[in-house]
Structure formats: C-alpha cells, structure tokens
C-alpha cells in the first residue's frame, strides 16, 4: 500500500529536489496541530500567532482577545491558564526543565476584570506545580516539595504539608520514578470536581538508593547530580494518599486514604486517582509484582470526616499471562450514576477492549470486541461513548474515532473518522468540549496533518482549524520517499512493517537497508503517521531503504504478541528484527552486504543485541543511549516485564540478557555507541559498561558522548548527533560524501 506516492513525472523532475540533512535539522518540514483549550461547551481559547490569548465562540463564530501579547510580554510569559470563573489568568515564565514532564516556573496572576496583575501575597518562586480549582479561582501549588492553597489569588496561602524535603519527601509532585514510569505527569494532586476537596500523594524516598553523576558545566569543579532512583530490585518509594477539605483546610487537616488490605500486605504502587463526585474518589493500586491491580472506590464519611473504602467497592484486575494492563493499567471513566464505569482491559480472547463494570469485574459487560484493540476512551456522555481503536481495515497502526450510542438498546457503533479524508487521515486523536457538544479531530497522517472542528451531535465538520498549507506548499518541490505499510506472516506471528523507499525506487536494483528499531514492550513503531525526519532524508537523498518492524512485545495486536516477551526481554524482540531482515533480503532489492540497524533507548538495547547476534546479517549499527543490563534500569518499568533480579525469581535472565555478555560478538561489526553523560533516565553507566566489556574483549568500536546531555540529546547536540550518525552510515554503506 503506497501511502505517499512520489512525484516522478519527467517534466517536474528538474524542479524537484531531495531532502537534505539541513532540512531535517532546521525543522523545515515540521507540522502544526491545533488543540482547542476548551472553557465551556462552545468556547475555547487559543494563543494566536502574535501571542494574544483569544476566546472563540463556535456558535456565534465570534472571537475576541482576553489577554494581550503586551501583557504576556511584560512578564515574558510562555504559557497561561484561565481560572474557571474567568476572573484570573496565571502567566507562566522562567520555564526550567527538570525531568521528562517536570519543570519549575515563575507564576504571575493577572486580574481580567481590573486589567492588572494581582499585587500582594505574590506567589513564591520557583514553583514546581500550580493549578486552578475546577470551579472558581482557588489555587493549589507546590513549592519546595510542600503544597499550598489559596482561596483567592490575592489571599495569603494556607500551607497544607510541612514535611517536604528535597530528594526525600515529595508532596503533590512525583519523585523521579513515579513521574517517568507510573504517573507520566509532573503533578500528584487532584481537585475534586467542584473544588471541595484536594487529594494528593506523598512520596517518601528516604531509603531509595541514589544515582549520582557529574554535571560538568563551566565551573572549575563539576557538580554532582543526585537522584533517588530505584533500580530493579532496589528499595522503592513509599506512597501515601491524603485528602484535604479546601473550604476548611485547618478543621481536620489532611486525611489519609486507606490502602486495600490485599495490596498493603507487600510492596505496592499507587497508579492513579480519579474523582467521581466531590465525595467519592477512585484510587488504583498495584502490587510490586505488577500482575495484580486493585481499583478502590472510596466515600467521604461526613460524621467522621474520613474516607471509607469498603471491600465491596474493590475491583481486582489480574493478568495470568503477563503484567496488568498495557503500558500502564487503564483508568476508569465513570458514568453519570457515579458508581459504574467503563474501562479497557483484556477480554477472554486476549484483546484489550472496553468493558462496563456495574457491580463486579466478573460481571463486566463487554462493549467492544474483535481481533483488534480499543485504545482510549475519550468521553462518556449520557448517550454516547467516544473511543479510539485500530479496528478499521485491520491495520494495527491506524487510529480512528468511534461513537457508541449507550442511550439506546442495542447500542449502535459508528466510525466518526474512517471515511473523512481516507487517504490523508488514518491516525486520529480527539479533544472534546464540555458535554461533548463539540470536538476537535487532530489527524496525524499518513498525509499532511490536519485539525478540524466538529459538531458533537451530528459529527458534521464545522471548520478547519489547521491544515498546514505552508508545509504543503514547501513540500511541492521535494522528492519525498515512498512509504508502505505491509505485514509478514512468520511461524504464526504477524510482523507489521513500514518500509521507506527512495523516490525513484526500482525493484530490480539493490539498495542498502537500515533497520530503525525501538521494540520496547507495549510500543508501536509501525504507525500511519506523517513524518519528514532523518530517515526520510536517508531515503530521499542517500538512496537507502529504511524499515521499521513491530515484533513480539509490541502493542495493540493482542496479548499473545504483547506478553510474549514477559520475563524474557531481549530475546524475541531481537529475533523478530532478524527474521524481518531475512524476509526483506528475499524480496530481492536489498544489498545483503549493506545492512545496518540503529535504535535509541530500548531501541539501542535491541540494536546492540541484534548486532551481537552472530548472524552476520548486519555490517554496522548504532546504539543511542542504550540500556545494557536490566539491573541498571528503573524498578517500576523493569520489574513490570522482568520480575525481580533475585535467585528465586528471574536473576538468571537478567544476567543472560545483558549487552556486555555478548561483547565478543561485536568483533565482526562496526559499532557506534552514543550516550549523554547527564542521562537521568538510562544512565551513562549503561554505555560505560558496554565500552568496558568491549575494551576487555579487545573489540574495536566507535563511540561518542555528549557532555551534560540527557536522554533526549537536544539542542546543538541533536545536529551533531545526526551529522555524526549520517557520516557513520555513509561510510558503512560506501556512499560518497
């Protein structure tokens, strides 16, 4: 299936040019998306190109500016947030990145009714997290690991927690491992729907071992960065959940929410919190051995001013074939009765589907079914449930939005997006206004991305929000590579792949092949999305064929494929990449002597193991910031898939699956190893150990480090990285510079 045909008519050929590396590094062909900042059923805010904050009313078609770029510029604001009572806006400046999601910033409050900044009782700086209550204009914020509350922006703050301490106790914000591997947010506090209560997590990292690395900076002596970071099998953070009444915060103070007994009996995690009503809350817990999850619904006891979590409102989700959930355990979406909910989990056939839980999980009613997967529940209204899945035409790498009518019986299903712009758009997400009165669809490809606005009742398109016209025009004279998504059937396993082919691809010729791999559990690389990136350039300008393959362990194709890697990381992911390469060779257009593999992070681990597989298939390869031993990586992630590195659990496979154990096998390949020295995620230690093992085995290799760079290798390092990798590959493939 050719998704992006190249234009090769002779008359055009002389005006067309190939992509250059400079195009990629400059972001010349990047696209824009439009996500409305909904403030009601029919209104949204958007930051205009000239930085004004504009309110749009869909029904009147009118818009007006509520905050000028002049006000934004006066405090160098890069972000904003309107209070739900529409009286105030917080302006965020001095953004300072911490980890993947977390950052600190300075916050100013602007009073829209009076056209001036709120003076008196200003916020301290820098703040770790700040948010409005869902109703009115109360403020909760985290400063120096403690939580504060303001009834109104100009009021003095009420301090909720007092035990916050850097790297020891975190209140309202996650520690490193919870941020990266469990919550995937910068915050760990949640307002109740009307702002009566505020729930928050406290993480105690006192006993967690610390990862320490040098940050070289510009000073005479490097700084040492210390992060409490539990590696596989190490001591984990201790989590507690508290709820405080924000109307009378000093009355009884924070009340702890009890942990279900079956969870509290051994090491456990808190995985998410969902408010149902102001007096009902749903907490999800997970055993450290992550195949048992408990969803606990708790109610406020007015008489005792405490939270009660009856055993009858505990719902257990257990996996017998792998870990609980996909990447994370899914979260519930509650219906209007405030007790029943919709949730995605595996059905009896091992496919993730939407279920409706009214009393017990055992009596759950399956809402969707088939040999495909429901991926996200966007919104449940009185009469409709909106979700995304990869059902349409049986392509796992697509995402379409569906509506199920739950108000009628039997419920009817309609695909909202399947036939809108069928060639251009096969991968969607959506954003809904209050009561799903309107919604925005954001299409990511395979054609040029487009964002549109729709009526939530009729699904009619109202207007185009962003169609990337400039990008479309800029690409008119570019020879883009062709892309095709197909599948291989091998030993009862379906291997979906994406192949990126040079513009003048000729099946009778031989081309160098580059495999790009990620391959981590519950990931997906073969997606019908638009991208003009480094591999597009390699195909367009350098004439390489690039392939991405989703093997065992990858997502959205059922539990059999997903859980195949359980407790055996580093085996089948590698096997499946190798199998695919052999199949590609059989296709007849691959030069067997010029095959390379590269990957980043988990992909760096897989590419390293593939190079060291002893197959002789790969001439060369690159590993960027690879994991080299699962004993070096974070507990929450690693143990989910590998269990514990103990003798009576899975230590043997921890030891067998290292890159270092295969050092000898790198002798006959050209290996480029790359890592940032300030990688807080996959520590530089991983590459240091690979390098040590290769040196000890007297195996030659190439390496590049990036001083003071983290797992993302951003900024100028990005340019240097891709330039360096390009030279390496061109040399490997004997391509002239």
């Amino acid at each position: 299936i050719v998704l992006r045909p190249s234009r090769v008519h002779n008359s055009e050929e002389n005006t067309m040019r190939a992509l250059t590396l400079k195009d990629i590094l400059n972001g010349t062909f990047s696209y824009k998306t439009f996500f409305p900042n909904w403030i009601s059923g029919q209104e949204y805010l958007h930051q205009s190109a000239d930085n004004n904050i504009v309110l749009y009313n869909i029904e009147t078609g009118q818009s007006y500016t509520i905050l000028s770029n002049r006000t934004m510029k006066s405090v160098n604001a890069s972000n904003y947030g309107l209070s739900p009572d529409r009286q105030f806006v917080y302006l965020e400046s001095d953004y300072s990145k911490l980890w993947r999601y977390s950052y600190t910033a300075t916050y100013y409050i602007y009073d829209l009714s009076n056209g001036e900044f709120v003076r008196g009782n200003e916020l301290p700086r820098p703040i770790q997290y700040l948010c409005w209550s869902p109703v009115g204009s109360k403020l909760a914020y985290v400063y120096q690991n403690n939580i504060y509350l303001k009834q109104r922006p100009g009021d003095p703050p009420f301090q909720i927690t007092f035990n916050g301490r850097e790297n020891k106790i975190f209140n309202g914000i996650p520690d490193w491992v919870y941020e990266e591997e469990m919550l995937a947010t910068k915050y760990a506090l949640w307002w109740s729907p009307n702002g009566k209560f505020l729930a928050y997590a406290e993480f105690n990292d006192t006993d967690i071992p610390v990862i320490a690395y040098s940050y070289y900076g510009d000073e005479q002596y490097p700084r040492t960065i210390n992060i409490p970071y539990p590696k596989a099998g190490a001591k984990n953070p201790v989590v507690r959940i508290f709820i405080i009444d924000t109307t009378y915060p000093a009355y009884v103070g924070p009340q702890e929410v009890p942990v279900p007994a079956m969870i509290a009996s051994s090491d456990y995690y808190f995985s998410w919190l969902t408010w149902v009503t102001d007096e009902r809350v749903c907490l999800q817990w997970l055993k450290r051995v992550q195949n048992v999850s408990v969803l606990s619904i708790c109610d406020f006891r007015e008489d005792w001013q405490t939270w009660d979590c009856p055993k009858t409102q505990e719902h257990i989700e257990e996996s017998r074939t792998g870990w609980a959930g996909g990447f994370f355990v899914s979260t519930p979406v509650f219906s209007y009765d405030a007790i029943s909910y919709y949730k995605i989990f595996s059905d009896k056939d091992g496919y993730k589907h939407i279920h409706y839980i009214k009393d017990t999980v055992e009596n759950a009613i399956q809402i969707t079914s088939g040999k495909w997967e429901a991926i996200n529940i966007f919104r449940v209204t009185q009469d409709s449930l909106f979700y995304s899945s990869n059902e349409f035409e049986e392509y796992p790498g697509r995402r379409n939005i569906y509506r199920i009518s739950i108000g009628s019986y039997p419920p009817s299903k309609k695909c909202v997006t399947c036939h809108l712009r069928k060639e251009r758009c096969q991968y969607y997400t959506a954003s809904f206004s209050d009561y799903a009165k309107y919604y925005a669809l954001v299409c990511y490809g395979p054609g040029i991305p487009i964002s549109t606005l729709h009526d939530g009742r009729t699904d009619q398109e109202i207007k185009i929000l962003e169609e990337n016209k400039e990008l479309e025009n800029a690409l008119k004279n570019i020879q883009l590579p062709k892309e095709e998504i197909k599948k291989l059937e091998v030993d009862e396993i379906t291997l979906w792949y994406k192949m990126i082919l040079p513009p003048q691809f000729d099946r009778s010729k031989k081309y160098p092949l580059l495999i790009q791999v990620y391959g981590g559990p519950c990931s997906q690389s073969v997606r019908s999305v638009f991208a003009v990136n480094w591999i597009s350039y390699l195909a367009s300008k350098e004439g390489m064929v690039i392939a991405l393959v989703d093997g065992r362990g990858t997502a959205f194709q059922g539990d059999k494929l997903l859980y195949a890697v359980y407790r055996k990381l580093g085996v089948y992911e590698v096997e499946d990449q190798i199998t695919a390469v052999r199949k590609f060779i059989e296709m007849g257009f691959i030069d067997e002597k010029r095959i390379a593999i590269w990957g980043w992070s988990y992909g760096g681990y897989v590419s390293s193991l593939a190079l060291a597989s002893g197959t002789g298939l790969f001439k060369c390869g690159i590993a960027v910031a690879p994991v080299s031993s699962w004993e070096y990586y974070a507990s929450v992630y690693t143990e989910r898939f590998m269990g514990l590195p103990t003798k009576d659990d899975n230590l043997e496979h921890y030891k067998n699956s290292t890159v270092m154990a295969r050092a000898e096998y790198f002798r006959n390949v050209d290996y480029l190893l790359i890592h940032g020295t300030a990688d807080d995620n996959v520590h530089f230690q991983n590459s240091a150990q690979i390098a040590k093992a290769l040196v000890n085995a007297q195996v030659d290799f190439q390496a590049m480090w990036y001083s003071d760079q983290n797992h993302g290798l951003s900024g100028l390092s990005t340019n240097h990285l891709y330039t360096h990798m390009t030279h390496f590959l061109k040399q490997c493939f004997s391509l002239s510079d």
Epitope: S40, N57, T60, Q62, Y64, T65, I66, T71, R86, L112
Partner: nanobody
Framework: QVQLQESGGGLVQTGGSLRLSCAAS????????MGWYRQALGNQRELVAG???????YYPDSVKGRFTISRDNDKNTIYLQMNSLKPEDTAVYYC???????????WGQGTQVTVSS
Amino acid sequence: QVQLQESGGGLVQTGGSLRLSCAASGSIFVGNAMGWYRQALGNQRELVAGITSDGITYYPDSVKGRFTISRDNDKNTIYLQMNSLKPEDTAVYYCNLWPPRIGFASWGQGTQVTVSS
C-alpha cells in the same frame, strides 16, 4: 457603537431584593458569555455571576443561593435577581462579557446598589 446599559439599582434594606437589567447593543454580546461584576468603594472589581450562551451559570460562594443570573437572548438583555441582600453587597454593579474583552473601554456607567442595615 457597542454599549452596555445597566439599570435597576437602588437603596434597599438588609434582606431585601433587587432585579438588575443590562441591555447590550452590538454584535459582540449576541450569544457570548456575559457576567455581572461589582466594585465596592476602595475595592477591586469582582465577578458576582456569569452565564454562558447556553445558560450554564456560575456564582462565587459569597452570593451563591442568593443571586440568580439569567438572559433573554431575544431582547439582548441579561438580568441579576438579588435576594437576601446584605450590607456587604453594596457596590456599583456592571455587566460585561465574561471574561471581559481587553481594551474594551466601554464598561457601562454601572448601577449603584446600596444595602442599609
């Protein structure tokens, strides 16, 4: 010329009631969210009620249960029914877009509400 004309204020005793009206001319007000604001002597202007085009309302705790905002889209008018008035409700009451538009100089003259004890 966009204009907002507030009316209905007056002097009333504690516990009494008043109904304020705001007539809006100009297309910007048609179908947009509107609010009632007040400013007491020496204080900042503050919101007392808001209503969206589809009739969803908001009230701060200080007036919740006592004040009711409504709108008549045909007449381009919004109303504020104020019951159980208290001395602290004494202020000049204004109507405007909710939130207000920037550079929107034409806040109306407002209407004075005085609650005596």
